[in-house]
């Protein structure tokens, strides 16, 4: 795993990136687990990095990734309660230069490395699906959500609502 | 809709300090964050310090060790202590929150009105 040094020596100026002339309003660190607390965990293995989901040892320190997040620049076409506020995506990136990407023909999850702008397919659509969980939908295609599936990070579609609190497309992030 | 309503702006001598709120109200089902940003004149809005809802905060280098955010997840509101003030930190404070309603899983971002900071002798 890339552990936390790694990761704190990749302190970036908060305004520092654009992306197709749009910065992200809010970047931090945070580790993420799924909803049975295994942690997604990033390994450098034949030059390419992989994903694990996985328990880790007692004192086993984290990995943390670099949310961070875009308004989007298009209104939401959600009918609601009045809601004025702007969609927001995230991007996720475990280390400087890789962001976490999704890939719709092999419904898999790879970190690429890649210079900005980013592509469409490293934004996800952020959802508080249940208390104190995230999950992240592809910009690219709605209804697909990051999910585990065999101790990976897979994409999932869900089809319908009552399927969006599934618990494998469920994370929770930590500061700590 | 969600509301953002801040307070504590003013006008302060070098050195002083104040301490900005914010109160979200509305139909709030979950805050993912809330943070603060500011805009002096003819410049970009810039993000001042960010707090999630697990605690984590994020301060932008020109603040550091002089800004403290801090949260009360009971009433929905962030605070900014802001101390050793300087002329450069003269702008309008915005508050900003990440939270999705009861209508919609999706999280949205919304935005104050914004608060006022002059710092002159």
């Known amino acids: 795993a890339f552990g936390i040094s790694g990761v704190q020596k990749y302190t970036r100026a908060l305004h520092d990136s654009s992306i197709t002339g749009i910065s992200p309003i809010t970047e931090y660190l945070a580790s993420l687990s799924t909803y049975n607390d295994q942690s997604i965990t990033f390994a450098l293995e034949d030059e390419s990095y992989e994903i694990y989901v996985e328990d880790l040892k007692k004192d086993e320190k984290k990995d943390k990734v670099l949310l961070s997040y875009y308004e989007s620049q298009h209104p939401s076409n959600e009918s609601g309660d009045g809601v004025d506020g702007k969609m927001l995506m995230v991007t996720l990136s475990p280390t400087k230069d890789f962001w976490l990407h999704a890939n719709n023909k092999e419904h898999s999850v790879e970190l690429h490395k890649c210079e900005k702008p980013l592509p469409d397919q490293a934004f996800f659509v952020l959802h508080n699906m249940h208390s104190n969980c995230v999950s992240f939908e592809c910009k690219t295609d709605p209804g697909v959500f990051i999910g585990v599936k065999d101790n990976h990070l897979a994409l999932i579609k869900v089809d319908s609502s009552e399927n969006l609190c599934t618990e494998n497309i469920l994370f929770k992030l930590s500061e700590t | 809709q969600v509301q953002l309503v801040e307070s504590g702006g003013g006008l302060v001598q070098p050195g002083g300090s104040l301490r900005l709120s914010c109160a979200a109200s509305g139909s709030i089902r979950t805050v993912n964050y809330m943070g603060w940003h500011r805009q002096a004149p003819g410049k970009q809005r810039e993000l001042v310090s960010v707090v999630t809802s697990g605690g984590g905060t994020n301060y932008a280098d020109s603040v550091k060790g002089r800004f403290t955010i801090s949260r009360d997840d009971t009433k929905n509101t962030v605070y900014l202590q802001m101390n050793s003030l300087r002329a450069e930190d003269t702008a309008v404070y915005y508050c900003?929150?990440?939270?999705?309603?009861?209508?919609?899983?999706?999280?949205?971002?919304?935005w104050g009105q914004g608060t006022l900071v002059t710092v002159s002798s």
């Open positions: 900003n929150a990440a939270a999705s309603t009861y209508s919609s899983t999706v999280v949205r971002s919304f």
